[in-house]
């Protein structure tokens, strides 16, 4: 399916609006520091060029690859060297090396100011004055902060963002209408970004075999009535879509995602009974709906797996004939029977089964060797079950904030070398698993919890890769994707760590504490808690609880005082001295 002009092909397939949006996202994800106006200029130039190619596919440069066209355009930015330093060296390379170079310079933690939400009236005025610019700005600001955000999904978020303003700026109480919608979009957006980051890490660090295995497991849980061949086709297509998006090929990715949605809706009968309501929606909504669709009901008459995968004399023959197909079928069969298992657990079981076959199929009597393989799965299943049970009990006992604090202490003791902001961010997100998953029925708890934890721990891995400080983190992050969570769970107090010297400045607070939002106050307190553990890694829970209770009391007292700053100045050193004594 070759086209004389790739850019014309994509422009025609996607339409001008989506084409421009995706090019803006692509450029913003590559050049994260460039001002908005610069990106808009580049996008307009690319769009005008695409239109000339639509008019005449033989026109000059229309036959060039998208990487060549986009890379050439990015390399025209005048301040590339001053703003991006060595990324400018990418421009000396030829494709495909140039694009690989740009990808390697994507920054997961760009030094950008946090987005401040203006007053509702200010936002509504901006929306009405220039809707197109307002929405472009949204795409730009999200994309530059989340350089791996799933681009076609970001277009869906932008459509919802637009709908929220269109509705709420007409409402009697604009703020009451708009703010909850914006909060929801922000939270969903962060979650979507983190989930996509794991997909890209899986593809880039562990290869497409790892991603395909994940997809087989997940789609088999979602579509247990679909045949293996159907699931395999969806997995192949989905892998192509995500490979393209993770590789910066956003136009191809969005186009292929639309094709996949079309295929699924045309073949609902052989996929899932749950797709119907998705398929009536417009494209962006339809693709989102299909990605989030609930699991179909399991067929009632599924036979035992043992017959084909343990009792059969042909196990080793089938394995030898097509290892990946046989293991894929095992994973499909196991996953469709177990919507109650996390995808990561299913992948561990498939890995264990593969290891058993590798060992046993080399034996003179393989069956004698692998007869008890399913019994070996029991500890693998029980480990996450127990972990979820224990942590949900702790969450219910403590509530979210204190549960986060327990995790902060736990993870700081495991990997005290990691930066305090990273430990706070990751532990706060790990702690959100409680509210997200513990309220669910038993059968949904493990898939919710463990697969969410995998997403959060990937964030730790991604941030740590940028600035590696801990061999333990590197080991857990790189050895095995499916065993990352158990690897981190198994880490104990780092005995080799030399405690951080006490720095009074770290524990000095001012009256500005009192004007912070509840969330910001929590982050301040949790930052102090991490620093405390880094200073005294062997402090007991009771000691830390005592210090944190004193801290809360001290802040509350000073925030009620008439002269807040004077109170902080006087009470602060007392709190520090008392804390040091309590931890001595």
């Amino acid at each position: 399916d070759t086209h004389k002009s790739e850019v014309a092909h994509r422009f025609k397939d996607l339409g001008e609006e989506h084409f421009k949006g995706l090019v803006l996202v692509a450029f913003s994800q590559y050049l994260q520091q460039c001002p908005f106006e610069e990106h808009v200029k580049l996008v307009n130039e690319v769009t005008e060029f695409a239109k000339t190619c639509v008019a005449d596919e033989s026109a000059e440069n229309c036959d060039k690859s998208l990487h060549t066209l986009f890379g050439d355009k990015l390399c025209t930015v005048a301040t590339l060297r001053e703003t991006y330093g060595e990324m400018a060296d990418c421009c000396a390379k030829q494709e495909p090396e140039r694009n690989e170079c740009f990808l390697q310079h994507k920054d997961d933690n760009p030094n950008l100011p946090p987005l401040v939400r203006p007053e509702v009236d200010v936002m509504c005025t901006a929306f009405h004055d220039n809707e197109a610019t307002f929405l472009k700005k949204y795409l730009y600001e999200v994309a530059r902060r989340h350089p791996y955000f799933y681009a076609p999904e970001l277009l869906f978020f932008a459509a919802r963002y637009k709908a929220a303003f269109a509705e709420c700026c007409q409402a009697a109480d604009k703020a009451a209408c708009l703010l909850p919608k914006l909060d929801e979009l922000r939270d969903e957006g962060k979650a979507s970004s983190a989930k996509q980051r794991l997909k890209c890490a899986s593809l880039q660090k562990f290869g497409d075999r790892a991603f395909k295995a994940w997809a087989v497991a997940r789609l088999s849980q979602k579509f247990p009535k679909a045949e293996f061949a159907e699931v395999s086709k969806l997995v192949t297509d989905l892998t192509k879509v995500h490979t393209e998006c993770c590789h910066g090929d956003l136009l191809e990715c969005a186009d292929d995602r639309a094709d996949l949605a079309k295929y699924m809706c045309e073949n609902q009968d052989s996929i899932s009974s749950k797709l119907k309501e998705c398929c009536d929606k417009p494209l962006l909504e339809k693709s989102h709906c299909l990605a989030e669709v609930e699991n179909d009901e399991m067929p009632a008459d599924l036979p035992s797996l043992a017959a084909d995968y343990v009792e059969s004399k042909d196990v080793c023959k089938n394995y030898a004939e097509a290892k990946d197909v046989f293991l894929g079928m095992f994973l499909y069969e196991y996953a469709r029977r177990h919507p109650d298992y996390s995808v990561m657990l299913l992948l561990r079981l498939a890995k264990a089964y593969e290891a058993t076959l590798e060992k046993c199929c080399a034996a003179a009597d393989p069956h004698e060797c692998y007869a008890k393989v399913f019994d070996e799965f029991q500890p693998l299943v029980e480990e996450p079950q127990n972990l979820v049970k224990q942590n949900c009990e702790l969450f219910e006992q403590l509530g979210e904030y204190k549960f986060q604090n327990a995790l902060l202490v736990r993870y700081t003791k495991k990997v005290p070398q990691v930066s305090t902001p990273t430990l706070v961010e990751v532990s706060r997100n790990l702690g959100k698993v409680g509210a997200k998953c513990c309220k669910l029925p038993e059968a949904k708890r493990m898939p919710c919890a463990e697969d969410y934890l995998s997403v959060v721990l990937n964030r730790l891995c991604v941030l740590h890769e940028k600035t590696p400080v801990s061999e333990k983190v590197t080991k857990c992050c790189t050895e095995s994707l499916v065993n990352r969570r158990p690897c981190f769970s198994a880490l104990e107090l780092d005995e080799a760590y030399v405690p951080k010297a006490f720095n009074a400045e770290t524990f000095t607070f001012h009256a500005d504490m009192c004007t912070l939002s509840e969330k910001e106050k929590q982050v301040k307190k949790q930052t102090a808690l991490v620093e405390l553990v880094k200073h005294k890694p062997k402090a007991t829970k009771e000691q830390l609880k005592g210090v944190m209770d004193n801290f809360a009391a001290f802040v509350e007292k000073c925030c009620k005082a008439d002269d807040k700053e004077a109170c902080f100045a006087e009470e602060g050193p007392k709190f520090v001295a008392a804390s040091q004594a309590a931890l001595a």
Epitope: K313, D314, V315, C316, K317, A320, C361, A363, A364, H367
Partner: nanobody
């Protein structure tokens, strides 16, 4: 694609000897245990002998113990069955398989023991 090609069969008198070979391709031969299976006219398949991937562990059906020897050469991707003191009841089509499978994935080689 897995391919197993047996050879070495033929007509032999009772008490005679034959050596069967099985040339393997399309899979990592050196990683798999292998077996010889036979099927006499009008009967079901019967497992004869097995060997592990390294050649260290060998197993035999009671009916052939002491008379047949299984071996392998991983470098040549070949499995062997040395058959001595052959009897008329050894008459069958012999085929090699992966693991302990008794599914016939090849033509096999005919062994006839008759005076």
């Amino acid at each position: 694609q897995v391919q197993l090609q047996e050879s070495g069969g033929g007509l032999v008198q009772p008490g005679g000897s034959l050596t069967l070979s099985c040339a393997a391709s399309g899979f990592t031969f050196g990683s798999f245990g292998m077996s010889w299976v036979r099927q006499a006219p009008g009967k079901g398949p019967e497992w004869v002998s097995a060997i592990d991937s390294s050649g260290a562990d060998t197993r035999y059906a009671d009916s052939v113990k002491g008379r047949f020897t299984i071996s392998r050469d991983n470098a040549k991707k070949t499995l062997y069955l040395q058959m001595n003191s052959l009897k008329p009841e050894d008459t069958a089509v012999y085929y090699c398989t992966i693991g302990r499978s008794t599914s016939r994935g090849s033509q096999g080689t005919q062994v006839t023991v008759s005076s």
